[in-house]
């Protein structure tokens, strides 16, 4: 049976916590990703940004989980208008920002 949206979001949050907690060396070798607008369509936008990071096992599970939240197919090189124009940040900072935002969505009951 499908996982309830609240459970799926909780699991995504916990996965992001694990990533930030287990950071020994720079996450994904310090790779940079496009910063995104966190106000709407956050799951697809986050996936569109992170999918361009390859060969980083630490975020592969996060990429798969975000894919489950995004209703359309996302491929590398694809960007929506939710990208913050010409602003790149390290994956580690991206994950931290995304984590805080998702915790707020969970509090507000926005599970989808």
């Amino acid at each position: 049976s499908p996982v309830p949206p609240s459970t799926a979001l909780k699991e995504l949050i916990e996965e992001l916590v694990n990533i930030t907690q287990n950071q020994k060396a720079p996450l994904c070798n310090g790779s940079m990703v496009w910063s995104i607008n966190l106000t709407a369509g956050v799951y697809c936008a986050a996936l569109e940004s992170l999918i361009n990071v390859s060969g980083c096992s630490a975020i592969e599970k996060t990429q798969r989980m975000l894919n489950g939240f995004c209703p359309h197919k996302v491929s590398a090189g694809q960007f929506s208008s939710l990208r913050v124009r010409d602003t790149k940040i390290e994956v580690a900072q991206f994950v931290k920002d995304l984590l805080v935002h998702l915790k707020k969505l969970f509090r507000e009951g926005q599970f989808n």
Partner: antibody, heavy 122, light 108 residues
Framework: QMQLVESGGGVVQPGRSLTLSCAAS????????MHWVRQAPGKGLEWVGV????????HYADSVKGRFTITRDNSKNTLNLQMNSLRVEDTAVYYC???????????????WGQGTMVTVSS | SYILTQPPSVSVAPGETATITCGGN??????VHWYQQKPGQAPVLVIY???DRPSRIPERFSGSNIGNTATLTIEDVEAGDEADYYC???????????FGGGTKLTVL
Amino acid sequence: QMQLVESGGGVVQPGRSLTLSCAASGFEFRTYGMHWVRQAPGKGLEWVGVIWDDGSNTHYADSVKGRFTITRDNSKNTLNLQMNSLRVEDTAVYYCARAPQWYLTAEAFDLWGQGTMVTVSS
Amino acid sequence: SYILTQPPSVSVAPGETATITCGGNLIGAKLVHWYQQKPGQAPVLVIYDDSDRPSRIPERFSGSNIGNTATLTIEDVEAGDEADYYCQVWDYSANHMVFGGGTKLTVL
């Protein structure tokens, strides 16, 4: 200005009852979840319970569940804490505090009252 | 129920940086709030949602929350910062608000 004012504290014998009130002013009371927090002399803060903005839900700390009841009257901007079967360990300063109401009430308390002292003693 | 662990006391000299920790199982998955309480006064919110600061709180106060530890940092500590500090989270599983035991900050 925004304000919460508690009243109703005093000395009461074990096993008796007491009702505390919290009067809100300067903000839209009905849009906030309201909490009670207590602090025993020389001790830390202990959450007592919460009532949702519309009064539809209440949650209580295990230590007071079944003995304390939180109610609110949004037409009068008042919050109440009915305390029954009081115990010596209920002795504390009782604060009311507001928190913006979210689906799961995990919000910070951005406004507190000055507190009212409750002493349970024989 | 969810337990938050704080050191009972932290001491720091004026002008130095104070670090107060709040430990909890996967606390990084929760939004953490911090309060300052001076003797005989009601608590005051100093940090909310892990790292946000109310407008009236000086920039010297900051917060972080990673893994199993949330941290309140006070830079350039002043005598007026001497107080008890409490962390707080909402325990979703129990529908309870939880406070840490509090940390007494002493400015030497």
